[in-house]
């Protein structure tokens, strides 16, 4: 079960539903972006491979005071089996490359859409 209860969903949902809703939230962010997202904050780039949900959360959790990505942070926590806190990093981070949050979101969205189309929901 993908359990996002208490975060963004009304309770446990299928993995495909959780991924669908995460994609829609990222679409929302990209569509509604007017000023630079999160004031142009920079985050560590990640390898979009297995374990990327935790890696993405580890990157984004270091952005504070940005309400636009708070829901995304909560949703990503539902995909990550362990607790993630600011300053925590995994081997999936490309530690020599920082990108703007807006670009990070776009890259993540493109990859998640590809996974969704290919039926890779877990």
């Amino acid at each position: 079960l993908t359990c996002l209860g208490g975060f963004a969903s009304p309770g446990p949902v299928p993995p495909s539903t959780a991924l669908r809703e995460l994609i829609e939230e990222l679409v929302n962010i990209t569509q509604n972006q007017k000023a630079p997202l999160c004031n142009g904050s920079m985050v560590w780039s990640i390898n979009l491979t297995a374990g990327m949900y935790c890696a993405a959360l580890e990157s984004l959790i270091n952005v504070s005071g940005c309400s636009a990505i708070e829901k995304t942070q909560r949703m990503l926590s539902g995909f990550c089996p362990h607790k993630v806190s600011a300053g925590q990093f995994s081997s999936l981070h490309v530690r020599d490359t920082k990108i703007e949050v807006a670009q990070f979101v776009k890259d993540l969205l493109l990859h998640l859409k590809k996974l969704f189309r290919e039926g890779q929901f877990n």
Partner: antibody
Framework: EVQLQESGPGLVKPSETLSLTCTVS????????WNWIRQPPGKGLEYIGY???????YYNPSLKSRVTISRDTSKNQLSLKLSSVTAADTAVYYC????????????WGQGTTVTVSS | DIQMTQSPSSLSASVGDRVTITCHAS??????LSWYQQKPGKAPKLLIY???DLHTGVPSRFSGSGSGTDFTLTISSLQPEDFATYYC?????????FGGGTKVEIK
């Protein structure tokens, strides 16, 4: 109460494009997911795809190369286009709602019959 | 795609009978299964979701059970309005898929 009403030509010639519209009343297509499902005569249900409240789309890979789902938010309508149709596309076509965070279809239109024949 | 197989494809029963329809998924779908009722010339209607949760307004004679790959829809006491075709649907992964249907006819 949300209601769905499908409309479109009942007869389409082979190799042409099937075009259907679903009008949503009592709710907004800028929320939830709006789906197309079809049912060939005397057969089961086949999922075609959806358009989301953001305008994002998903198509069943078995039909992907021929399907386009779009929307007109000003008219609160979604549409289905299926190109290069054959007799195998003869079916009753339904639009159905799927609410956010769900995976089941809670509201359906009454369906519209499309026959592919020359 | 996940294949959904229903059995039987049709059955004959009398008013008051207890009717059981089964649905088998080709892979584990946890409890992400719904059931629909369809009458001739009409759209399907949602009966049950999450394998056993009754949709609003659905009579309590309908019940669902199961998890993983095997599921059951039970009508405890068949009523005249229950003669219809029933479909299961998996929500585990896209594309969503339906069973072939079970037609419940009057004996």
């Amino acid at each position: 109460e949300v209601q769905l009403q499908e409309s479109g030509p009942g007869l389409v010639k082979p190799s042409e494009t099937l075009s259907l519209t679903c009008t949503v009343s009592g709710g907004s297509i800028s929320s939830d997911y709006w789906n197309w499902i079809r049912q060939p005569p005397g057969k089961g249900l086949e999922y075609i795809g959806y358009i989301s409240y953001n305008g994002n789309t998903y198509y069943n890979p078995s039909l992907k190369s021929r399907v386009t789902i779009s929307r007109d938010t000003s008219k609160n309508q979604l549409s289905l286009k299926l190109s290069s149709v054959t007799a195998a596309d003869t079916a009753v076509y339904y639009c159905a709602r799927l609410a956010k965070w769900t995976w089941y279809f809670d509201i359906w239109g009454q369906g519209t019959t499309v026959t592919v024949s020359s | 795609d996940i294949q959904m197989t229903q059995s039987p494809s049709s059955l004959s029963a009398s008013v008051g009978d207890r009717v059981t329809i089964t649905c088998h998924a080709s892979q584990n779908i946890n409890v992400w299964l719904s059931w629909y009722q369809q009458k001739p010339g009409k759209a399907p209607k949602l009966l049950i979701y999450k394998a056993s949760d009754l949709h609003t307004g659905v009579p309590s004679r309908f019940s669902g059970s199961g998890s993983g790959t095997d599921f059951t829809l039970t009508i405890s006491s068949l009523q005249p309005e229950d003669f219809a075709t029933y479909y299961c649907q998996q929500g585990q992964s896209y594309p969503y898929t339906f069973g072939g249907g079970t037609k419940v006819e009057i004996k």
